[in-house]
Amino acid sequence: EPTMYGEILSPNYPQAYPSEVEKSWDIEVPEGYGIHLYFTHLDIELSENCAYDSVQIISGDTEEGRLCGQRSSNNPHSPIVEEFQVPYNKLQVIFKSDFSNEERFTGFAAYYVATDINECTDFVDVPCSHFCNNFIGGYFCSCPPEYFLHDDMKNCGVNCSGDVFTALIGEIASPNYPKPYPENSRCEYQIRLEKGFQVVVTLRREDFDVEAADSAGNCLDSLVFVAGDRQFGPYCGHGFPGPLNIETKSNALDIIFQTDLTGQKKGWKLRYHGDPMPCPKEDTPNSVWEPAKAKYVFRDVVQITCLDGFEVVEGRVGATSFYSTCQSNGKWSNSKLKCQPVDCGIPESIENGKVEDPESTLFGSVIRYTCEEPYYYMENGGGGEYHCAGNGSWVNEVLGPELPKCVPVCGVPREPFEEKQRIIGGSDADIKNFPWQVFFDNPWAGGALINEYWVLTAAHVVEGNREPTMYVGSTSVQTSRLAKSKMLTPEHVFIHPGWKLLEVPEGRTNFDNDIALVRLKDPVKMGPTVSPICLPGTSSDYNLMDGDLGLISGWGRTEKRDRAVRLKAARLPVAPLRKCKEVKVEKPTADAEAYVFTPNMICAGGEKGMDSCKGDSGGAFAVQDPNDKTKFYAAGLVSWGPQCGTYGLYTRVKNYVDWIMKTMQENSTPRED
């Protein structure tokens, strides 16, 4: 318990103190007092450095004194032989004696009293930053005007904290700038801008003068900027050492100015402004930004448009562009959206053709359509090569997105006809020599396939049966063979409007316009035994000359039989029409003069008895194409004749090409358009 005074006596005082003694006294006076310790008697064995016996006075860790020997007062009016004044409120006194004393020593008598200390002057470290006021038992600190005493009750500082700056532009300076800033202060300034703006601080070198760093490089006074988890500084010295433009990337900035007790300089002045938060110019592959700018900031909106062949897929919907906004956090909205290659998907299949499974269906991929060669070819050109275009469609250079159309190759027999022996006077043939040959079973006749949906024949073949049964692809027309061949079902029969319908067809003498078309219900699949014949062109190249050779085929009457079971064929030259007129009609049903001969008829035959006959009607008179001699076209259709084995008359198909085309176009299916 602290006391204000006290007495300390050596053991047995005033008798001699014993040997081998160590005794200590802990003196404590109240807080805020010092101790005045004084000795009125001192008689202790003398030794060098008081090594044998001594009284030791210790203040904290410091030895205030060590006494031995004999002392007497120098002042006749005072009994004090030795005294100590310490500004602390604790003191330790230790008495030690060794094992022997040569004489009898009486020890010491000492007294202590609590004394007032002047904290304001008695210490090396001044307790107050500014004004120190001493009183008995303590002191208090006070401050100059405009300063306030900190919570530690010792330090004065200016009231420079708590300012919050929210304006988009402003200026902040150290207290008293440009006069010296206050010592021992911590000034905190807060800049708080609207989200989406970053604080940008600008300083001039000459506007900064803060006490320089110590030898270790530590700032004694410092200016620090803190933006979120980023810190700029500490800065100190003469002239601003940091970047003159600090982009904080944050809308909140704390400015902390810390000063110590010494070395005041003029301080600092800065300007700040709110920059809209920049968003990075991101490298978004396969796209362009509109508008294109060197820098994008908060609230900027860009349209990101995918390059041709790329699209942004959100859910199941594909778009070619999207909008992105520079947000308050410096990040772009919709940043997850990306321009991906357009996917054209699995290409559509086509009739009578194929497309290889593509390795890829993405933008730029290439596919190739092919037709089922050699029976089909690509009608609408373009080569069949399509690439996956930017709009997600498979596109061809010529056709665009339109699919290729595989149409039958016409006029090309798989096996060319060769006369093996000497129809009338003809040779056995194979259906592969005449794959266009169509068999009509009622009446027994022929026709020519001209495309997938149409059969060309003579009008007199179908005038009595508008629903004929037809077969293709068979050399033999035996019932058992026909069962295995392809039967064609008619949808409609179109007889040429110029064909005169008679009540008694058997008595006919006028075969002008002996031509008809049969529209089929279903398309015919082409192959080696079924393939159409070409139609003639309308140019003069397709005008026949006398002597031009043509091929006829059919299952009609031969020299030996009324009807052939196996296909027969013959090669006939074109003859002048007069040659047909000159032949006497075999079984006339009327006067010879009644028979009509017109420019719509071709006369052919007269060579080695080769001719068409009853049952061959409607079959094609096939002539080599004048320009593409690997093909045959239907120059004529077996129509009538004066006498089998001589000359025959054939409908001149060239004169009906317009009617044929018009009829087919007007009665086509959408698939054929």
Epitope: E373, P374, Y377, V409, V412, P416, E418, E419, D541, M545, D546, G547, D548, L549, R571, P573, V574, E607, Q624, P626, N627, D628, K629, T630, K631
Partner: antibody, heavy 112, light 110 residues
């Protein structure tokens, strides 16, 4: 017009392709023939390609030559030339007015 | 097979004279026959098509005739410019053919 190219000196057995480049008409509508003429000899027909791409060859030329076409060219490949194949090779358009259009020819020399 | 035999192999004729060249087909080819003229180092030139039709720009002294298997080219009033080799060509089929051309007839002017 027609123009042959590709003729050169080759060693026996080295395949060689001659090309006939056409302009002014469509190959899809015409028959094109290849004809050759050995030095001091007559015209010898090799083969033909039709508008649809069908080909026919002279009986002696089958297997020795291959004819193919694109939209603007007709090719003749001599699969394994021998010294007897040394000749000027012509391509011609063969129409209803016969060989109405011929190229100038290209010389092929086969020598070891 | 369709083969063409041309005769004679060569012929000499005086200026102003007449030359007759014959061509025979092994099978009937109707009128599908053409005649060509070829001068050394040049491409063949079409003279006659469809057996008897004169090609464009060909002088009327050239005349073709025949049908079926027998055909003839006649050059009347021969001129020096007519010195050349003449070929016939069957224009009917490409199937089963060794050569569509005849062997050629060389016409020399005296």
């Amino acid at each position: 017009s027609l123009e042959e190219s590709g003729g050169r000196l080759v060693t026996p057995g080295t395949p060689l392709t001659l090309t006939c480049t056409v302009s002014g008409f469509s190959l899809s509508s015409y028959t094109m023939i290849w004809v050759r003429q050995a030095p001091g000899k007559g015209l010898e027909w090799i083969g033909v390609v039709g508008g649809s791409g069908i080909t026919y060859y002279a009986s002696w030329a089958k297997g020795r030559f291959t004819i193919s076409k694109t939209s603007t060219t007709v090719d003749l490949q001599i699969t394994s030339p021998t010294t007897e194949d040394t000749a000027t090779y012509f391509c011609a358009r063969d129409t209803s007015v016969a060989g109405d259009l011929w190229g100038p020819g290209t010389l092929v020399t086969v020598s070891s | 097979a369709y083969d063409m035999t041309q005769t004679p192999a060569s012929v000499e004729v005086a200026v102003g004279g007449t030359v007759t060249i014959k061509c025979q087909a092994s099978q009937s080819i109707g009128v599908s026959l053409a005649w060509y003229q070829q001068k050394p180092g040049q491409r063949p030139k079409l003279l006659i098509y469809k057996a008897s039709n004169l090609a464009s720009g060909v002088p009327s002294r050239f005349k073709g005739s025949g049908s079926g298997t027998q055909f003839t080219l006649t050059i009347s009033g021969v001129e020096c410019a007519d010195a050349a080799t003449y070929y016939c060509q069957q224009d009917y089929t490409y199937s089963d053919v060794t050569n569509i051309f005849g062997g050629g007839t060389k016409v020399e002017i005296k």
